[in-house]
């Protein structure tokens, strides 16, 4: 690696992957092992992130970019840049301080993460429950009760295609 120096603005001359060494008359020196600088003109390099324990390496550290981590199977990322790993639960459960717990009646969770959410209240939209909710699935709302009078179909057929100048049959 060629150590470089600029007379006018020594540090701005140092590219990513190097640091501008105050102690060496501001020459550009390569980042030491397990460190990186993602921008030019840095006085020091930063220490590479280490993906340990429940974290696993998604992208290795290089002299110009930090390592990126994700989570081992059974865990999922939380926070910016996967700063934390949280335990997965099954669908129909949520993570509490005491571990994974089933969703209470009237709530559901269709993912391995997050909290149990209340079933949709179909009546608020003037609709009825078409399919009951479970711990893993939300209710499915159908047409309003008035639409379900005798003889009425619970599924509305598609409207026939109309051409300009023709009234519906």
């Amino acid at each position: 690696f060629e150590r470089t120096r600029s007379l006018q603005d020594p540090c701005s001359n140092c590219p990513a992957g190097t640091f501008c060494d105050n102690n060496r008359n501001q020459i550009c020196s390569p980042c030491p092992p397990n460190s990186f600088s993602s921008a030019g003109g840095q006085r020091t390099c930063d220490i590479c992130r280490q993906c340990k324990g429940v974290f696993r390496t998604r992208k290795e550290c290089s002299s110009t970019s930090n390592a990126e981590c994700d989570c081992t199977p059974g865990f999922h990322c939380l926070g910016a840049g996967c700063s934390m790993c949280e335990q997965d639960c099954k669908q129909g459960q949520e993570l509490t301080k005491k571990g994974c717990k089933d969703c209470c009646f009237g709530t559901f969770n269709d993912q391995k993460r997050g909290i149990c959410r209340p079933w949709t209240n179909c009546s608020l939209d003037g609709k009825s429950v078409l399919v009951n909710g479970t711990k893993e699935r939300d209710v499915v709302c159908g047409p309003s009760p008035a639409d379900l009078s005798p003889g009425a179909s619970s599924v509305t057929p598609p409207a026939p295609a109309r051409e300009p100048g023709h009234s519906p049959q």
Epitope: F19, D21, N22, N23, S35, R43, T44, C45, D46, I47
Partner: antibody
Framework: QVQLQQPGAELVRPGASVKLSCKAS????????INWVKQRPGQGLEWIGN????????NYNQKFKDKATLTVDKSSNTVYMQLNSPTSEDSAVYYC????????????????WGQGTSVTVSS | DIQMTQTTSALSASLGDRVTIGCRAS??????LYWYQQKPDGTVKLLIY???RLHSGVPSRFSGSGSGTDYSLTIRNLEQEDVATYFC?????????FGGGTKLEIK
């Protein structure tokens, strides 16, 4: 563990140069910068200069360019600072310190400090 | 040379208090700011490096923050052993320079 050993006190005659020592242990001596810092009684801290033991590269604060001379003895893991033509203004505690690892975020921080040598310039 | 200013030269606080000590630089330091603790017996220790990173062995009651020219050291749950003088130092460019120090006492 990292240690920087300095003598507790030195009494110096005005005009008679004195050489302060700083013996390092507990780490790879040649791989870290050693600084010298001055503190007058009841005052703040002043950086005098530093030296890299591996190749004896030095930097000096312009204010101390003619006052201090930094040298190293690799065989004994010791750094020296000679105070030239001392006057009463040079009566102070002198600390040697060690920088962090080259290139890392704490590189220019003084990670470890000696106990300091109290220098009294008096006839 | 970069001038480092600690406007408060002395402050007094009670045990358990939260204390903040400020430091201002005459130019942008790009976070190359360090904090030291000097005990009454003269012993000096590095507390914080690169603005906010805790040096090994330093209690988590100490924290640092700031950017550009303005930086601060915060001590939570003040303890008797925190009685000391606190100095900031810039490592942005030579010569390294220190603030004048802030002497912390217990009420």
């Amino acid at each position: 563990q990292v240690q920087l050993q300095q003598p507790g006190a030195e009494l110096v005659r005005p005009g008679a140069s004195v050489k302060l020592s700083c013996k390092a242990s507990g780490y790879t001596f040649t791989s870290y910068w050693i600084n010298w810092v001055k503190q007058r009684p009841g005052q703040g801290l002043e950086w005098i200069g530093n030296i890299y033991p591996s190749d004896s590269y030095t930097n000096y604060n312009q204010k101390f360019k003619d006052k201090a001379t930094l040298t190293v003895d690799k065989s004994s893991n010791t750094v020296y600072m000679q105070l030239n033509s001392p006057t009463s203004e040079d009566s102070a505690v002198y600390y040697c310190t060690r920088n962090g690892v080259e290139g890392y975020p704490h590189y220019y921080a003084m990670e470890y400090w000696g106990q300091g040598t109290s220098v009294t310039v008096s006839s | 040379d970069i001038q480092m200013t600690q406007t408060t030269s002395a402050l007094s606080a009670s045990l358990g208090d939260r204390v903040t000590i400020g430091c201002r630089a005459s130019q942008d330091l790009s976070n190359h700011l360090y904090w030291y603790q000097q005990k009454p017996d003269g012993t000096v220790k590095l507390l914080i490096y690169y603005t906010s990173r805790l040096h090994s062995g330093v209690p988590s009651r100490f924290s640092g923050s700031g950017s550009g020219t303005d930086y601060s050291l915060t001590i939570r749950n003040l303890e008797q052993e925190d009685v000391a003088t606190y100095f900031c130092q810039q490592g942005y460019t030579l010569p390294y320079t220190f603030g004048g120090g802030t002497k912390l006492e217990i009420k």
